[in-house]
Interface confidence: low
């Protein structure tokens, strides 16, 4: 029997080859575009991760961009000291020196000037004197009892530098700024021959179930958790401790029908703050059933288990957990490198290329 093909057969083979080639190219193209969804409770570090992507993969912030953050640095600094002063009233903590009461009044009078991106020597002096006060420091040490920006001490300890008239915020200063995210922030960058689209939906405050399906088919979800939230005192308008709120949210995302094919990457963030806190505040504040030691390693591992145990598809779905410090560029760079390798591996699997 002959092996020769008819013209029709040849055409069919060519057509089949072309379809295979197109499928492979489409698969490779799809494998090259990575959609990342950043999720997590408020102030868990999502926006800081976005800023790190700009620093690591997009040459960082230009001098002009840094200058624009000056007003935010000043606002964060002033809001931090004001938050402490107001908490002193609520917690009934006195100033170490009576004269500080006048500085506190002056602070409220002068605070407005910093909104124009100027910190007058008078205002800087008032903040410095207040920050050095024993009562203020006592109140700062009790910040778990009220809401205080994580970067409060970063800026307040560096007042001499940031209050200079020629001050230009550094990349680290920019990373430390806190601006409430509104809406959905989209960031694009290229890394390891992949085109990343990162979506920070932290500012999307409306009911999650109404919009979450729009992100069906995202390559991966990076879920941020602030480890240091474990000991925060429940605010009157909160139903549950921030850590438990975070676990509830993670449960709903991890086991969501829209994300059955999505890699779930868990960033247990603010590990630096957690490492300091765990020396003073026992983990039983958050997890009364915890019987382990209050060492960083054991306590962090326990929290990791608490989150990973929420995964109801353990046989088919793996949670990729990393301990992070979102303000540490080297740490984020290292972790994101590992995350990208997981994404590449999983993507190639899905496209039949692995």
């Amino acid at each position: 029997m002959g092996c020769t093909l008819s013209a029709e057969d040849k055409a069919a083979v060519e057509r089949s080859k072309m379809i295979d080639r197109n499928l492979r190219e489409d698969g490779e193209k799809a494998a090259k575009e990575v959609k990342l969804l950043l999720l997590g409770a408020g102030e868990s570090g999502k926006s800081t991760i976005v800023k790190q992507m700009k620093i690591i993969h997009e040459d960082g912030y230009s001098e002009d961009e840094c200058k624009q953050y000056k007003v935010v640095v000043y606002s964060n600094t002033i809001q931090s000291i004001i938050a402490i002063i107001r908490a002193m009233g609520r917690l009934k903590i006195d100033f170490g020196e009576a004269a500080r009461a006048d500085d506190a009044r002056q602070l409220f009078v002068l605070a407005g000037s910093a909104e124009e991106g100027v910190m007058t020597p008078e205002l800087a002096g008032v903040i410095k004197r207040l920050w050095r006060d024993g009562g203020v420091q006592a109140c700062f040490s009790r910040s778990r009892e009220y809401q205080l920006n994580d970067s409060a001490s970063y800026y307040l300890n560096d007042l001499d530098r940031i209050s200079q008239s020629n001050y230009i915020p550094t990349q680290q200063d920019v990373l430390r700024t806190r601006v409430k995210t509104t809406g959905i922030v989209e960031t694009h960058f290229t890394f390891k021959d992949l085109y990343f689209k990162m979506f920070d939906v932290g500012g999307q405050r409306s009911e999650r179930k109404k919009w979450i399906h729009c992100f069906e088919g995202v390559t991966a979800i990076i879920f941020c958790v602030a480890l240091s939230d474990y000991d925060l005192v429940l605010a009157e308008d909160e139903e549950m401790n921030r850590m438990h709120e975070s676990m509830k949210l993670f449960d709903s995302i991890c086991n969501n029908k829209w994300f059955t094919e999505t890699s779930i990457i868990l960033f247990l963030n603010k590990k630096d703050l957690f490492e300091e806190k765990i020396k003073r505040s026992p983990l039983t504040i958050c997890y009364p059933e915890y019987t382990g030691s209050n060492t960083y390693e054991e306590a962090a591992a326990y929290i990791q288990c608490q989150f990973e145990d929420l995964n109801r598809r353990k046989d088919t779905k793996e949670i990729y957990t990393h301990f992070t410090c979102a303000t540490d560029t080297k740490n984020v760079q290292f972790v994101f490198d590992a995350v990208t390798d997981v994404i590449i591996k999983n993507n190639l699997k899905e496209c039949g290329l692995y």
């Epitope: 107001r86 908490a87 009233g89 609520r90 917690l91 009934k92 006195d94 100033f95 170490g96 020196e97 009576a98 009461a101 009562g135 009892e145 009220y146 005192v233 605010a235 009157e236 308008d237």
Partner: antibody
Framework: EVQLLESGGGLVQPGGSLRLSCAAS????????MYWVRQAPGKGLEWVSS????????YYADSVKGRFTISRDNSKNTLYLQMNSLRAEDTAVYYC??????????????WGQGTLVTVSS | DIQMTQSPSSLSASVGDRVTITCRAS??????LNWYQQKPGKAPKLLIY???SLQSGVPSRFSGSGSGTDFTLTISSLQPEDFATYYC?????????FGQGTKLEIK
């Protein structure tokens, strides 16, 4: 039982002075924030002044600043309000009250019965 | 200073009625709001602190709710001893400020 007992009110001419006292008992006075609140006849409540525990930081309403002085004597468990340069608009019942903090929230949980100050010529 | 506005200024109701008094702050005060009751010739008495926490010894027919700028004091079933003037007070910012009062009268 917590008790706050004001005294020292009375009739005084405009420009005159009065010193109000508030004797406290039934709680640890020295560690309590204390308030003076007043109420003009037929009107609402108005915060006048407060004094912290410990270092005794003092705070005043703009309407009395420079004329009134709040002070305390922890050894006598007594709160004072020295009122100088009195005006007709200072006419009111003056209450002393204890400010308590619970879970970061402050509120006035105990009040004295009040003492009437009348400024009139 | 933060302005506290109560409404209504006065209202008439009958024993057994459900009554609601509202208090609005000129800016957000989170839940740093207290409610007081005052009867003629008497000192004010604390009813509710932190917007919704019932002070010890206060009957459970009194309840408070709200956060941010809008707050409510509710009396579920008026009793004869509840006819008085009610004041809200914010404790978030210095100076502490009171609402102008709501006088609750017998219909």
């Amino acid at each position: 039982e917590v008790q706050l007992l004001e005294s020292g009110g009375g009739l005084v001419q405009p420009g005159g002075s009065l010193r109000l006292s508030c004797a406290a008992s039934g709680f640890t006075f020295s560690s309590s924030y204390m308030y003076w609140v007043r109420q003009a006849p037929g009107k609402g409540l108005e915060w006048v002044s407060s004094i912290s525990s410990g270092y005794s930081s003092t705070y005043y309403a703009d309407s009395v600043k420079g004329r009134f002085t709040i002070s305390r004597d922890n050894s006598k468990n007594t709160l004072y309000l020295q009122m100088n340069s009195l005006r007709a608009e200072d006419t009111a019942v003056y209450y002393c009250a204890r400010d308590v903090s619970h879970g970061g929230h402050s509120f006035l949980d105990y009040w004295g019965q009040g003492t009437l100050v009348t400024v009139s010529s | 200073d933060i302005q506290m506005t109560q409404s209504p200024s006065s209202l008439s109701a009958s024993v057994g009625d459900r009554v609601t008094i509202t208090c609005r702050a000129s800016q957000s005060i989170s839940s740093y709001l207290n409610w007081y009751q005052q009867k003629p010739g008497k000192a004010p008495k604390l009813l509710i602190y932190a917007a919704s926490s019932l002070q010890s010894g206060v009957p459970s027919r009194f309840s408070g709710s709200g956060s941010g700028t809008d707050f409510t004091l509710t009396i579920s079933s008026l009793q004869p001893e509840d006819f008085a003037t009610y004041y809200c007070q914010q404790a978030d910012y210095y100076p502490p400020t009171f609402g102008q009062g709501t006088k609750l009268e017998i219909k």
